[in-house]
Structures are given as C-alpha cells and as structure tokens.
Interface confidence: low
C-alpha cells in the first residue's frame, strides 16, 4: 500500500487585505478512510479553519465540491482576508476513528496579508520656537503588513534628511506601526513653510500616502522695533512713532511709557501682512511738546505671543524754535490729552 | 516583545572588577539607546550610564572614571565593566532600554531587565 | 547635576480615591522646543520598575488612564484618579533633559 502524502504546493501565498486566499491541498491516496482538516499554526495551541464533517465557518469554502467521489483536493477559499488572518496553515489527514486520529500533515502554506498604512498623521510641537531654533515634527501610520516601508520627509518640496524612524513591533506581527520624528530648523521665511511626511508601501502601487503639517503653528518670529518723532504741523507737537515689524503670529500687546511710567496700552489691531507671512503694525502718540520737561524719553514696549516684553527708547528731541513757542506757564503731561490712544497706519 | 536579561557574577571580591552583560531579546539594538541602572539595598535607583547603537557612550560622571559600557552588535548584547569595587556598590544592577528619537531626545526608560543581585564581600 | 526632590515621602491610600505625587527639579526641565523632559515610573515589590509616564504627561503604553502627568518648568505631579490595589509601590520621577539622568527620592504609595 502506498504511503499517503499531503501536499500543500505552496510554501507561501500573499494577498491584500479585503480580497480571498487560496490554500491548495492534494492527498495521494483515498484510504484510509478519514477527514481533513485545515489548521492555523501548529501544535496544541493551533486554531481550527476549516473541518469538512461539522462546524460553520462562514468565510471558508472548499475549492471543489467534497462530496464528490474519488476527490483528493482539500484546497479551501477564504474571503475578505484581514491581517489577522496572517499565519501558516495546515492541510491534516484524519484517520477514522472514535475519535478520529490525526494521520499526516502537509508542510504548511504561510499565508502573508498586504495591508495599506493608515494616512500619515504629522503632529507638531506644542510650544512655538523661534528662528534659529530645532523644532520636531513626528509622522505616525498604523496597521500596515508586511513592514516594509519607506518613509520621507519633505520641507516645501526639499526632502529632509535628520529624522529618525521606528518600525513596531521589531518581530514578527500580523501589522505593524511607522513612528519618525524630523528636525526641522526653523528661518524667519517659515511662516507660509510646510513640512510633508511621505509613506511608500508595497500595497499603495507608487501611490505614495502623504501628512501634512504647517510651521506657522510652530513658529514664532520676534519683532523689530524702531522708534522715532516727526514733527507735526502745529509747532508745538510732535509725532512719536513706534514701528513693529516682521512678527508672527499677530498676538501683540504694545504699551508706552514715559521715562518708565505706563502712559497706554494697546493690543494689535489693523495689521499689515508682509509677503513672507509676517506682520507690521504701527503705533503713534501726539505730544505737546510745551508740557514736557527737559530728557523725556518715551519707551515702546512689545509683549508678543506671551514672550517677555521687549522695548525700544527714545529721547524727545525739541528744537529751540519749539521752546519758544511755549509760554512759560505751561504744564501738564507729555502726552496731549486730546490725542487718540493710538493709531495704526 | 523585547526581553532584557542581565547575567553576570552575584558575588564579587572588592577592589576586583565587576562584570556584568545584558542580553536584547526579541528586538533590534539599532535607534535606542542601552541603559545599567543599578539600586542599593533599600535605597533609590542611580543611573551609571548609557550606550547608543552607535557606540557612543554616556556616564554618570560620579562613576565615570571606574565604569565602561560596551556594545556587541553581533550578539544583540551590551555590557557593563565596574572597576575598584567596593561595597558600596552592592546593589541589583538593571539594564534597561531608552527610547531615543531624534528631535524629540529620551521619551522613556520603556523596557527593564528583572535585575541581578551583585554583592561585594571578601 | 539636576536635582529632583520628590514629595511625600510616604503616601497612604485608600483604594478608590485620588492620589497625587509632587516632583520638583533644580532647574527647568521644558526646553524651548516644547517637551518636558521628565517621567514617571513605578516599581512595585519585588518588580523591576516600569514607565508609567514620559516627556511630562503622555502615558506610556498599556498604562491605564487613571494615571495622569502634569506640570512644565520644575515643578511636576503624577495623579492617580483612583486608586487601585495594583498601585501600591515605590513612584519615582526622572529627569531626561540632561546627563547624568536624575531620578527623585522616590514615594512609597501603601494601601490604609
């Protein structure tokens, strides 16, 4: 009698997650009389697929029909496939008995599940930083197979090359998980910058995935600040104007203050949008200058974004001419009480 | 998932030198960086050091004159040489792994070896 | 060297009810580009320690949510907002701004 041989043809078959596995299995002999069964794994632990006798196994079908006289292909149909599935299963002959006794097991086919990465999702960091500074962008995708994956990084279409890249778990997974994290040095132009994270994977047929996330919720341009009078037509005022350029993001709160005493507070309102992304504002104070006394100066001082103030000084300059416009019995503040509390221009 | 064991003498002579070798199971070396920890009898926990994949290696500068980490790729193990015992250095001696990534630094001492007892007795 | 002082030095509790744990550094542990560097970790009896929290307030993996990290700068709490048998231990925190790593004194956290 001719020994009896499972043939799992196979060693290894590859689908994508959603589509239907085919397991083929082919006995030599029709005796001894006795079932098959399809097994995950092997062992006592292993999980029962597929047994002709009894059992619903909804997703399993048998390629041809098991009733049929004289049949020796046990080949079975999985369908909708999803990585849980991933593992090596076995065709096993049964000899008949009470209970039946397992007689010969094929080699084993090692079902390999394709599953597309998850759409990359680039977070930032909490905390704003200045130009000059590192700040890190990190790119999660999930539930991905086989872990093979390339991922790059893109700042405005230049690819980056500081980053660093996890693959998880490092052993054998039914998915897997990509964590990379880049550093990005920041320049005063990166307001309308953005930084890309691109996934590649076998399941995505050179269609890469791509997360996206903008430096303008990372990044904080200081301002500059420059001071300066011009006079005004009535002979006795003059303009004293606080310029605040090239800052972002708009948040500003500007107060003046004469020779170190808070004199106004403003918080930014009209601004002027610099190509780059940026903003400048404008503040101003009309002062009488018969009111002053001699070495007034008027300081500009610039909270932005919750950062400690910065400030910019200026001594009043009056011309001799002015003085002599002014009776002597002038007095009162430096800043013309009829003045606005500001203005933008 | 990844294992750490420690192995290595549980006694060692003073002034001699302690060795002691920690074993990445289930895992890579590569992007961490290999941690010995180590905690006297009933005291709290002092880092002695630490070694990146690429060798690169850090320690506590109140050891750093006695101790030496090194790293053995080929062999998914990283070591520890202890110079001058005394014992005060007896203690359970951990590996441990640190996760490193770049941008970010060190976010977590995420996996530990159960420990190994080492005492210092002549 | 960064120095971590951690308070209490004991913490009874009662299971089911809230539990917190101060940990002050020497000097600030956020960097300017936004992280905390310091974590938590708990070592139960006869445990090696494990990570409960890292860069401040993400818990680590398989930590349950009932503990929770706060605080920026030096000064920084671990909550539990109810507390369980499991939990008893010694809590420590760890500064991994700079080397030397720096762990505090510990807490022990014990069942009334």
């Known amino acids: 009698e001719e020994e009896l041989q499972v043939i799992q043809p196979e060693k290894s078959v590859s689908v994508t997650a959603g589509e239907s596995a085919t397991l083929n299995c082919t006995v030599t002999s029709l005796i001894p009389v006795g079932p098959i069964q399809w097994f995950r794994g092997a062992g006592p632990g292993r999980e029962l697929i597929y047994n002709l006798k009894e059992g619903h196994f909804p997703r399993v079908t048998t390629v041809l029909d098991p009733t049929k006289r004289n049949n020796m292909d046990f080949s079975i149909h999985i369908s909708n496939i999803t990585p849980a599935d991933a593992g090596t299963y076995y065709c096993v002959k049964f000899r008949k008995g009470s209970p039946d006794v397992e007689l010969k097991s094929g080699a084993g086919t090692e079902l390999s599940v394709r599953a597309k990465p998850s759409a990359p999702v680039v977070s930032g960091p909490t905390a704003r930083a200045t130009p000059e500074h590192t700040v890190s962008f990190t790119c999660e995708s999930h539930g991905f197979s086989p872990r093979d994956i390339t991922l790059k990084w893109f700042k405005n279409g230049n690819e980056l090359s500081d980053f660093q890249t996890n693959v998880d778990p490092a052993g054998k997974s039914v998915s897997y998980s990509i964590r990379s994290t880049a550093r990005v040095v920041l320049t005063r132009r990166d307001v309308h910058s953005q930084v890309i994270c691109e996934v590649a994977h076998v399941t995505l047929q050179g269609d890469p995935l791509r997360g996206t996330a903008n430096l303008s919720e990372a990044i904080r341009v200081p301002p500059t600040l420059e001071v300066f009078q011009r006079p005004m037509r009535a002979e006795n005022q003059v303009n004293v104007t606080c310029q605040v350029r090239k800052f972002y993001p708009q948040r500003l709160l500007l107060t003046w203050l004469e020779n170190g005493n808070v004199s106004q507070t403003e918080t930014a309102s009209t601004l002027t949008e610099n190509k780059d992304g940026t903003y400048n504002w404008r503040s101003w104070l009309l002062v009488n200058t018969c009111a002053h006394r001699d070495g007034v100066v008027l300081t500009c001082q610039v909270e932005h974004d919750g950062q400690p103030a910065v400030s910019k000084s200026h001594a009043l300059e009056v011309s001799a001419h002015q003085k002599e416009q002014c009776s002597d019995t002038t007095s009162g503040p430096v800043l013309a009480p009829t003045a606005p509390l500001g203005g933008s221009g | 998932q990844v294992q750490l064991q420690e192995s290595g003498p549980g006694l060692v002579r003073p002034s001699e030198t302690l060795s002691l070798t920690c074993t990445v199971s289930?895992?890579?070396?590569?992007?961490?960086?290999w941690s010995w920890i180590r905690q006297p009898p009933g005291k709290g926990l002092e880092w002695m050091g630490f070694?990146?994949?690429?060798?690169?290696?850090f320690y506590n500068p109140s050891l750093k004159s006695r101790v030496t980490i090194s790293l053995d790729m080929s062999m998914n193990q990283f070591s520890l040489k202890m110079t001058s015992v005394t014992a005060a250095d007896t203690a359970v001696y951990y590996c441990?792994?640190?996760?490193?990534?770049?941008?970010?630094?060190?976010?977590?001492?995420?996996?530990w070896g159960q420990g190994t007892t080492v005492t210092v007795s002549s | 060297d960064i120095v971590m002082t951690q308070s209490p030095l004991s913490l009874p509790v009662t299971p089911g009810e809230p539990a917190s744990i101060s940990c002050k550094s020497s000097?600030?542990?956020?960097?300017?580009?936004?992280?905390?560097?310091l974590d938590w970790y708990l070592q139960r009896p006869g445990q090696s320690p494990q990570l409960l929290i890292y860069?401040?307030?993400n818990r680590a993996s398989g930590v349950p949510d009932r503990f929770s990290g706060s605080g920026s700068g030096t000064d920084f709490t671990l909550k539990i907002s109810r507390v369980e048998a499991e939990d008893v231990g010694v809590y420590y925190c760890?500064?991994?701004?700079?080397?030397?790593?720096?762990f505090g004194g510990g807490t022990k956290v014990e069942i009334k």
């Open positions: 289930g895992g890579s070396i590569r992007n961490y960086y």
């Open positions: 860069l401040g307030s």
């Open positions: 070694i990146y994949d690429n060798g690169r290696t």
């Open positions: 000097q600030s542990l956020l960097y300017s580009n936004g992280y905390a560097y």
């Open positions: 760890m500064q991994a701004l700079q080397t030397p790593l720096t």
């Open positions: 441990a792994r640190v996760r490193a990534y770049s941008g970010i630094g060190l976010d977590g001492t995420d996996v």
